[in-house]
């Protein structure tokens, strides 16, 4: 009886098992019982990354600099181009189809995790004893100045956005 299923790296066509084309090659013509599957290498800027029966190779991804993208890894006949973002930007999706600027942490918040090529900045509110008075994508919350270590006293209490203000000891005391 004709086959109803085929081995790995084969496909069923016209009641016959034909070899799939290897990664980096596309299908030109199906096998017959007299000749094997005819495959051709993908052209420049094309790829196929699996054993396949595709009649057209896929185009390599274009890393559009207008979208903040650059090439992280050049594509081959078997792999797609991998894009990443320019410094200071990160991908908007796993596929990295476009980039956005890293989000800065506003005053009162500091950087808990710095942004990467694929993730945005993670901010945290500055806890008591810490402050941030700038909008930054890399500054952490800074500890309030310790007036005591400078032989000074607190003249104005700190907040999550401002440092304490130190002043001289009251000389009358």
């Amino acid at each position: 009886e004709p086959p109803t299923a085929c081995r790995e790296k084969q496909y069923l066509i016209n009641s016959q098992c034909c070899s799939l084309c290897q990664p980096g090659q596309k299908l030109v013509s199906d096998c017959t019982e007299f000749t094997e599957t005819e495959c051709l290498p993908c052209g420049e800027s094309e790829f196929l990354d699996t054993w396949n029966r595709e009649t057209h190779c896929h185009q390599h991804k274009y890393c559009d600099p207008n979208l903040g993208l650059r090439v992280q890894q050049k594509g081959t006949s078997e792999t797609d181009t991998i894009c990443t973002c320019e410094e200071g930007w990160h991908c908007t999706s796993e596929a990295c189809e476009s980039c956005v600027l890293h989000t800065p942490c506003i005053p009162g918040f500091g950087v808990m995790e710095m942004a990467t090529e694929t993730t945005d900045t993670v901010c945290e509110p500055c806890p008591v004893g810490f402050f941030s008075n700038v909008s930054s994508a890399f500054e952490k919350c800074h500890p309030w100045t310790s007036c005591e270590t400078k032989d000074l006293v607190v003249q104005q209490a700190g907040t999550n956005k401002t440092d304490v203000v130190c002043g001289p000891q009251d000389r009358l005391r």
Epitope: P2, S15, S29, E33, F34, T35, E38
Partner: antibody, heavy 117, light 107 residues
Framework: EVQLLESGGGLVQPGGSLRLSCAAS????????MSWVRQAPGKGLEWVSG????????YYADSVKGRFTISRDNSKNTLYLQMNSLRAEDTAVYYC??????????WGQGTLVTVSS | DIQMTQSPSSLSASVGDRVTITCRAS??????LNWYQQKPGKAPKLLIY???SLQSGVPSRFSGSGSGTDFTLTISSLQPEDFATYYC?????????FGQGTKLEIK
Amino acid sequence: EVQLLESGGGLVQPGGSLRLSCAASGFTFSSYAMSWVRQAPGKGLEWVSGIGSYGGGTYYADSVKGRFTISRDNSKNTLYLQMNSLRAEDTAVYYCARYVNFGMDYWGQGTLVTVSS
Amino acid sequence: DIQMTQSPSSLSASVGDRVTITCRASQSISSYLNWYQQKPGKAPKLLIYAASSLQSGVPSRFSGSGSGTDFTLTISSLQPEDFATYYCQQYGRNPPTFGQGTKLEIK
């Protein structure tokens, strides 16, 4: 024991026709692709035509396309080659062969076709 | 069609010799190549399939190698019954095509 026996060869005038037969025995004929291969006197082998198993497709060399027709009768375990519009360059020994995994593992003894006026 | 070119066209050798016949395809055929042996007045016999696999019943002194466009048939130690004509045949593209043959004669 696998056996292939060709018949139907002979002398024919240019433009004439002949039908070759190949009687198969010793195997399940319908399960195998079959082909015809020819060999002109003192020359090499030339694949002429093939027919798939289970009534599969038919295939021809460019040199015979449109003139030769391959067919099979699985109920009679017989392969045929209908040859029309014969030319002097078709003169050859014609072999039928069984196909397995893209190779011809069993061949008949051949039948001689002579095209001459 | 794919052209198959064998070399040499003929060669003389002695019993016990190691003999190599080459076959070149006009374009890449991966490992889709068979070798046949034909003796005068007889039908061809399949020796090697898929470039390097020995057909059942064929002596192990016969071996095949190669892929892409260049292939070889090697007989490690010639026996008297090996004097014959050898043909390569590709099945990478339709139609299947044969080389012109290599005639192996006794020296």
